[in-house]
């Protein structure tokens, strides 16, 4: 009975025309969910002439359905058992889900001072941004609608530049309409253990962001892996919008509606500073903000994002060290709401629920020639906005899941 | 002391252009502030033409200007110009360049040509 | 673009005695808790000189008897005692939006 089960299990998820795994795979049967709190600050003005802590106060959620397109490109190599793909993005705003509306205003950060002060560090080149901050009226924080936040908007300060340059500004920018990718991972055709585990990403097998084996590109995209799951398991995942791969640990068991799954989490050592986890120092860039590399739970992944001083973090600064979150005030991390976990079905190895959660985070620094981070007197590590990424088996795929997976084996 | 120098006064026919420049004494602060160009007409108030951040040569004009005049600069002599094209005689006016303060780049002039006057009779 | 208006368009203020200069925006020039208002004296046959900037900062080595209020729309030069040399045209100037607009000015006189 075992094996033949296994043998099923096998046949049914590779990633091949007719299987349920491929189906499931090139569009995903679960609704997924982007929730986004931003941080709006309180005290602009102290913070900016008299470098006081910041004041956030988070708003939110806000809610968009996402994840909601099927792969494109999607193309079989039988010759080395993979099949290559691209992940459109989309979002749709979900009002109903959300505490108001795309509209709403928020005091954040100024994503252009602050990225601009960061890349241009010439004195000289810095007096000529302070003209263009000043002329253009902006400031070092800005009022901004959460779609402008979110999706883009035309920066009055970057427009002042006669060359051409991306005026265009906004967290997630550019989004609705691109593509994440091209992945090529195994089909698992040849080799059931290494069904969905990436191959290359964007052609490459590295990343370019990262020294040694930080660089690597590991592991699957957490949506599933592959199947018979030990709790024992290091599960390794490759998430693009960390750029990095990370991993996650066996925590505890938990039935999703009557489907017994293995809740796997990020461990607070993922984010742990080379100090405490040795294999982390290859994730330490510079030694100024990360205290000669004894800062942890932050990712300075500027060399992703075309040198913009973005840092990744945990929601509310969960697992980071105190200097992180010291200049900030309003934060209150925990993890039953700011980690991450995946419900795996270890049998199939997919992933039939999970929350993704991250901060996104802006570093500002003061500068004598700008005029408007001069009386700054040290560093923020400035959090935006945390978002909370959800998805779970709906009730009719758990009933089909019941009988035909988890039923025959029990 | 001058600070800005103003080219000399300028009497020219209808449908002509004309070119006026104002020499910055201060080489420091020329490249990194931001050069106004304003006019005054007799009796009139004042109109904003436009200005430039002459180091990377980014440029406002009055939406009134854009067609009518052109603004450069060289960093090299420390000199504004700006070029007046089919002029008329409602271009008649003095002419001033101003300097943003010291380079903060707010819209408010500390430091004034002594103006040019440009005459087109009509 | 934004229109200002000066009033009164002239004034004559006996020697030693307070001038006040109102400029009226129409729409606020305010932005990021400051007001992109400035003053200028005019005399003849002189280009304008920097009196007060965002609205209330006196320039550098001009008397104290100058000073600058307001803000949004609303903004006053006050001339406080005035002196002889203090015959001239005044104009106010805002600097929140291009084009940069100056108001018709106001002359002052000695009475």
């Known amino acids: 009975g075992d094996l033949l089960i296994q043998k099923t299990i096998k046949k049914q998820v590779v990633l091949e025309e007719g299987t349920i795994a491929f189906k499931n795979w090139v569009k995903t049967g679960t609704e997924v969910y982007r929730q986004f709190w931003i941080f709006d600050v309180q005290n602009p003005q102290e913070v900016m002439m008299n470098s006081s802590n910041i004041q956030v106060k988070q708003r939110g959620p806000y809610t968009y359905r996402v994840r909601f397109l099927a792969k494109e490109n999607v193309t079989q190599d039988a010759e080395d058992n993979t099949v290559s793909f691209l992940q459109p993005n989309g979002a749709i705003f979900e009002p109903s889900l959300s505490v108001g509306t795309e509209a709403d205003n928020f005091t954040v950060l100024n994503l252009a001072v602050a990225a601009a002060s960061h890349i241009y560090q010439n004195q000289f080149v810095q007096m000529i941004l302070n003209s263009l901050i000043n002329k253009s009226k902006s400031s070092m924080f800005q009022v901004r609608t959460l779609r402008e936040l979110l999706w883009g908007y035309r920066d009055p300060f970057l427009s002042l530049v006669p060359y051409p340059v991306t005026t265009t500004v906004g967290l997630f920018y550019p989004y609705n309409n691109t593509a994440d990718g091209v992945y090529k991972v195994f089909n698992g055709k040849d080799n059931i253990s290494k069904v969905a585990i990436i191959d290359t990403y964007k052609g490459k097998r590295n990343l370019s962001y990262w020294e040694s084996h930080c660089d690597m590109i590991n592991g699957t995209d957490a949506a599933s892996f592959p199947p018979f799951v030990e709790k024992s398991q290091v599960l390794q995942f490759f998430s693009s919008d960390i750029c990095r791969s990370i991993y996650a640990v066996f925590e505890s068991d938990v039935n999703l509606k009557g489907i017994p799954v293995y809740r796997f989490v990020l461990p607070s050592k993922a984010f742990a500073s080379p100090v405490e986890n040795p294999d982390n120092y290859c994730f330490c860039t510079e030694k100024i903000i990360s205290k000669n590399c004894t800062s942890y739970g932050v990712l300075d992944i500027s060399k992703c994002k075309e040198g913009r001083p973005v840092y990744i973090s945990l929601p509310h600064f969960l697992y980071a060290s105190p200097d992180v979150s010291e200049p900030i005030d309003g934060l209150n991390p925990n993890e039953e709401e700011h980690r991450t976990y995946l419900d795996i079905e270890p049998i199939t190895g997919f992933t039939l629920q999970f929350a993704k959660r991250l901060q996104v985070n802006l570093l500002v620094k003061p500068s004598e020639k700008i005029q408007v981070l001069k009386n700054l007197k040290r560093n923020y590590i400035v959090p935006i906005l945390w978002l909370n990424e959800t998805g779970t088996i709906g009730d009719e795929k758990a009933n089909m899941f019941r009988s035909q997976v988890t039923g025959k084996i029990n | 002391q001058v600070q800005l120098q103003q080219s000399g006064s300028e009497l020219r026919s209808p449908g002509s252009s004309v070119k006026l420049s104002c020499k910055d004494f201060?080489?420091?602060?020329?490249?990194?502030?931001?050069m106004s160009w304003v006019r005054q007409k007799p009796g009139h108030g004042f109109e904003w033409i436009g200005d430039?951040?002459?180091?990377?040569?980014?440029?406002i004009y009055g939406e009134k200007f854009e067609d009518k005049a052109t603004l450069d600069a060289d960093t090299v002599s420390n000199t504004a110009y700006l070029e007046l094209n089919s002029l008329t005689s409602e271009d008649s006016a003095i002419y001033y360049c101003?300097?943003?303060?010291?380079?903060?780049?707010?819209?408010?002039?500390?430091?004034w040509g002594a103006g040019t006057t440009v005459t087109v009779p009509s | 673009d934004i229109v200002l208006t000066q009033s009164p368009a002239s004034l004559a203020v006996s020697l030693g005695q307070r001038a006040t200069i109102s400029c009226r925006a129409s729409?606020?020039?305010?932005?990021?808790?400051?007001?992109?208002m400035h003053w200028y004296q005019q005399k003849p046959g002189q280009p304008p000189k920097l009196l007060i900037y965002?609205?209330?900062n006196l320039e550098s080595g001009i008397p104290a008897r100058f000073s600058g209020s307001g803000s949004r729309t609303d903004f006053t030069l006050t001339i406080n005692p005035v002196e002889a040399d203090d015959v001239a045209t005044y104009y106010c100037?805002?600097?929140?939006?291009?084009?940069?607009?100056f108001g018709g000015g106001t002359k002052l006189e000695i009475k």
């Open positions: 100037q805002q600097s929140n939006e291009d084009p940069y607009t």
């Open positions: 965002r609205a209330s």
């Open positions: 729409e606020s020039v305010d932005s990021y808790g400051n007001s992109f």
């Open positions: 101003a300097r943003d303060y010291y380079g903060s780049s707010y819209g408010y002039f500390d430091v």
């Open positions: 430039i951040l002459p180091s990377i040569g980014s440029t």
């Open positions: 201060d080489s420091e602060v020329f490249p990194i502030a931001y």
